[in-house]
């Protein structure tokens, strides 16, 4: 029978007594940089090829045996998972292997850093087609090692990576935290994020989704015919690689942050118990699970959205938080969260030459984050109209003043340090949906797009009784662009996207009153491209 | 990408043999060699695998015992000796490129005749 | 191991199509993804036809296709033609080893 990992990643129209989906990601080539492999086993033979760079630290203590079958051991079995014969996710990718891990599975920034400029050096000689890195390791936080990666990515080239195996941050470790770098912790058979003896698998916002990694069955180098069970977030990363190479050979023109967008649009969503993961990186952590896509052809017509988070900005009055999007992608919204609620909002402004989202701390809080809403919009033209605050009691507007550009977002930013305490709330008069409303106090940021075929519209969900949490979904076809809380609210800490719903949190309702002042409205921008349908229903 | 076997061979019951093969044209620690006999009128028949990467093998349960397949990288060769052989080993003996046998010798006889 | 099952022989009219059962277990055929087919003139090594159950090696003619149900894989050669006639051999994995069908004889009338 299937092993429950290739059946978990696969969509059921794909199902019946054995995995075979369409094309193997024979067009992709998927660089595996781990230990030793023994690359005639009868589950990986003529896929991989061996090249002949190696850089390796000495293998540590005096009565180490080194044991061939246990040095090829953990980069065989993840040769096995990217494209074994019967247990592998994409069974037509080739592959080579740089080793950089030691007999004990150890290895250096150095020798790291030497292997990716191996690959950039053969893809400048022979440029072949579409070009995976699997990096199933993990060392401490190096800024040296994330921009070689950054650079990788640049030329074209998808890199995915372990999250790690320390129950920890996984933006305190290197590849893992490098943004271009797709990132990957583990999760069970009852998608449950895995638990590695005292320590399990990595979390929060520098992991990009989650895949299979534990018990996952794979080519052993006890014998040619051998499999054996793996578990780690190495195993997760394989998964993603094979995922990728089958993607990348369906559409081979696929940018880094389209696939990435793909990736996260097709996994399982929501299904991933957060209480595993520490309290404070529950709202960070993507509750995401990768799977293939149900085809690998048509997807190009929807409008590809996810959600950024900065890191912490630090308690300081002044601190700020940074979200940005990658190169590729257009920032359509920004909005921002704290947990103590003191917050002073949160703008879009350029930085580089391109749009990022900042979020300012507030005297007494205890910090805040930035929170993207990055897209994939082709021949975008986005603005940022700014409304400074009002003298009229009516509020701050700002609306899309330019024909033919939307709303995708709104954000507001203040000066005072408590906004809104003693406030009534303000609400958006009826039949103006294409402006931003905040306090007059506020200056207001409207994020204005032009597309073509781009349409969106505002969806709002009000609750007039307090409430820690209130949400908002965009309709199926529809993407979610923008997610604010309207204002009035005091006691709101942010407002955040979650793959398709706007969530706003609020502080805790039992220290709250049940006035008017309690009432929480959420507010969603939905948006779709016509011209990206019919796109493809052309090319189909 | 070529496998070059030794020429015939004629062996008295009881004799060992040794059958060559010579692989070229491509990576060999990327693949092992099987071999496989297929006796006069008779069908196929796997005898097992010899890894060139870490000399590594895989008999076939009838062949334990009899048979020693080895490789020597230096020389891109790997070797398939029988011993104690019977009449009943009289076959053509082929090598094969790994597990998934793509590519084939010419075949070598071996005759057990007294 | 055992062999796997094939008919002895088969034929077919030019032009025709014929196909060729390899009937195992769930040890080998039905367990794994890889059965293969091999095409044998007599004199001559065999050569692959089909690997992974339905894949063509580059040089091999589309006439010919492989396919698999639960324990029982398939080898189809469509618009038979006189340089088919050959014995085939079915092929698979086992959990250690490999094993061989015992061959058909194909003839082109």
């Known amino acids: 029978s299937i092993p429950w990992n290739l059946e978990r990643i696969t969509p059921p129209r794909y199902r019946a007594d054995e995995y075979q989906p369409p094309d193997g990601g024979s067009l992709v080539e998927v660089y595996l940089l781990d230990t030793s492999i023994q690359s005639d086993h009868r589950e990986i033979e003529g896929r991989v090829m061996v090249t002949d760079f190696e850089n390796v630290p000495e293998e540590d203590g005096t009565r180490f045996h080194r044991q061939a079958s246990k040095c090829d051991s953990h980069g065989t079995h993840l040769a096995g998972v990217v494209s074994g014969r019967d247990a592998g996710v994409a069974k037509g990718a080739s592959m080579r292997s740089l080793r950089v891990l030691n007999c004990q599975g150890k290895g250096t920034v150095s020798g790291t850093l030497i292997g990716l400029e191996f690959i950039r050096k053969s893809q400048l000689v022979q440029p072949v087609g579409p070009l995976v890195v699997l990096l199933p390791l993990a060392g401490g936080y190096s800024r040296v090692l994330n921009a070689a990666c950054q650079r990788l990515a640049r030329a074209g080239v998808v890199l995915v990576t372990a999250a790690g195996n320390f129950r920890d941050d996984a933006c305190l470790y290197s590849p893992a935290s490098a943004p271009e770098v797709i990132t990957v912790g583990a999760t069970n058979a009852q998608d449950q994020p895995v638990t590695l003896g005292t320590l399990g698998t990595n979390f929060g916002r520098c992991v990009d989704l989650f895949a299979p990694g534990e018990d996952i069955i794979g080519a052993s180098s006890d014998c040619s015919t051998c499999f054996v069970s793996q578990s780690g977030t190495s195993q997760a990363a394989a998964h993603v690689a094979g995922i990728a190479a089958m993607m990348l050979s369906a559409e081979p023109e696929l940018t880094l942050a389209e696939l990435r967008q793909r990736l996260i649009h097709f996994s399982a969503k929501d299904v991933i118990n957060e209480a595993w993961f520490p309290e404070d990186q529950r709202v960070l952590t993507p509750n995401l699970v990768a799977a293939l896509p149900p085809s690998t052809h048509g997807a190009g017509w929807q409008l590809f959205c996810r959600t950024v988070w900065s890191a912490h900005s630090g308690p300081t009055r002044m601190a700020t938080a940074v979200a940005r999007c990658a190169p590729d992608e257009e920032l359509l919204s920004c909005s921002s969260f704290s947990r103590s609620g003191k917050r002073r909002g949160e703008r879009m402004e350029a930085q580089g030459g391109k749009l990022v989202c900042r979020a300012h701390n507030a005297f007494g809080g205890e910090g805040v984050y930035a929170i993207a809403r990055c897209c994939l919009l082709p021949q975008a033209n986005c603005s940022v109209h700014t409304a400074p605050p009002a003298e009229a009691s009516m509020g701050t507007r700002v609306h899309c003043h330019q024909q033919g550009h939307v709303l995708t977002g709104c954000s507001s930013h203040w000066e005072v340090e408590d906004l809104g305490t003693h406030k009534p709330p303000v609400l958006r008069p009826r039949g103006q949906p294409n402006q931003c409303v905040g306090h007059r106090e506020a200056s207001i940021h409207a994020s204005c797009c032009h597309a073509p075929g781009l349409e969106c519209k505002v969806k709002e969900h009000g609750i007039p009784a307090p409430q820690e949490q209130v949400t908002v979904a965009c309709e199926e076809g529809w993407t979610l662009t923008g997610c604010s809380a309207l204002p009035g609210t005091s006691h709101v800490l942010g407002a955040y996207a979650v793959d398709n719903t706007c969530v706003v949190r609020s502080r805790d309702v039992s220290t709250t009153g049940s006035t008017s002042e309690g009432a929480v409205t959420a507010v969603a921008i939905c948006c779709r491209s016509r011209h990206l349908a019919q796109a493809s229903q052309e090319l189909q | 990408v070529q496998l070059v076997q030794s020429g015939a061979e004629v062996k008295k019951p009881g004799a060992s043999v040794k059958v060559s093969c010579k692989a070229s044209?491509?990576?060999?620690?990327?693949?092992?060699i099987s071999w496989v006999r297929q006796a006069p009128g008779q069908g196929l028949e796997w005898m097992g695998w010899?890894?060139?990467?870490?000399?590594?093998?895989n008999y076939a349960q009838k062949l334990q015992g009899r048979g020693t397949m080895t490789t020597d990288p230096s020389t891109s060769t790997a070797y398939m000796e029988l011993r104690s052989l019977r009449s009943d080993d009289t076959a053509v003996y082929y090598c094969?490129?790994?597990?998934?046998?793509?590519?084939w010798g010419q075949g070598t006889t071996v005759t057990v005749s007294s | 191991e055992s062999a796997l099952t094939q008919p002895a022989s088969v034929s077919g009219s030019p032009g025709q199509s014929i196909t060729i059962s390899c009937t195992g277990t769930s040890s080998d055929v039905g367990g794994y993804n890889s059965v293969s087919w091999y095409q044998q003139h007599p004199g001559k090594a065999p050569k692959l036809m089909i690997y992974?159950?339905?894949n063509r090696p580059s040089g091999v003619s589309n006439r010919f296709s492989g396919s698999k149900s639960g324990n029982t894989a398939s080898l189809t050669i469509s618009g038979l033609q006189a340089e088919d006639e050959a014995d085939y051999y079915c092929n698979s994995y086992t959990s250690t080893s490999m094993v061989f069908g015992g061959g058909t004889k194909l003839t082109v009338l």
């Open positions: 044209g491509y990576t060999l620690t990327s693949y092992g």
């Open positions: 094969a490129r790994g597990y998934g046998m793509d590519v």
């Open positions: 992974e159950v339905s």
């Open positions: 010899v890894s060139f990467y870490n000399g590594n093998t």
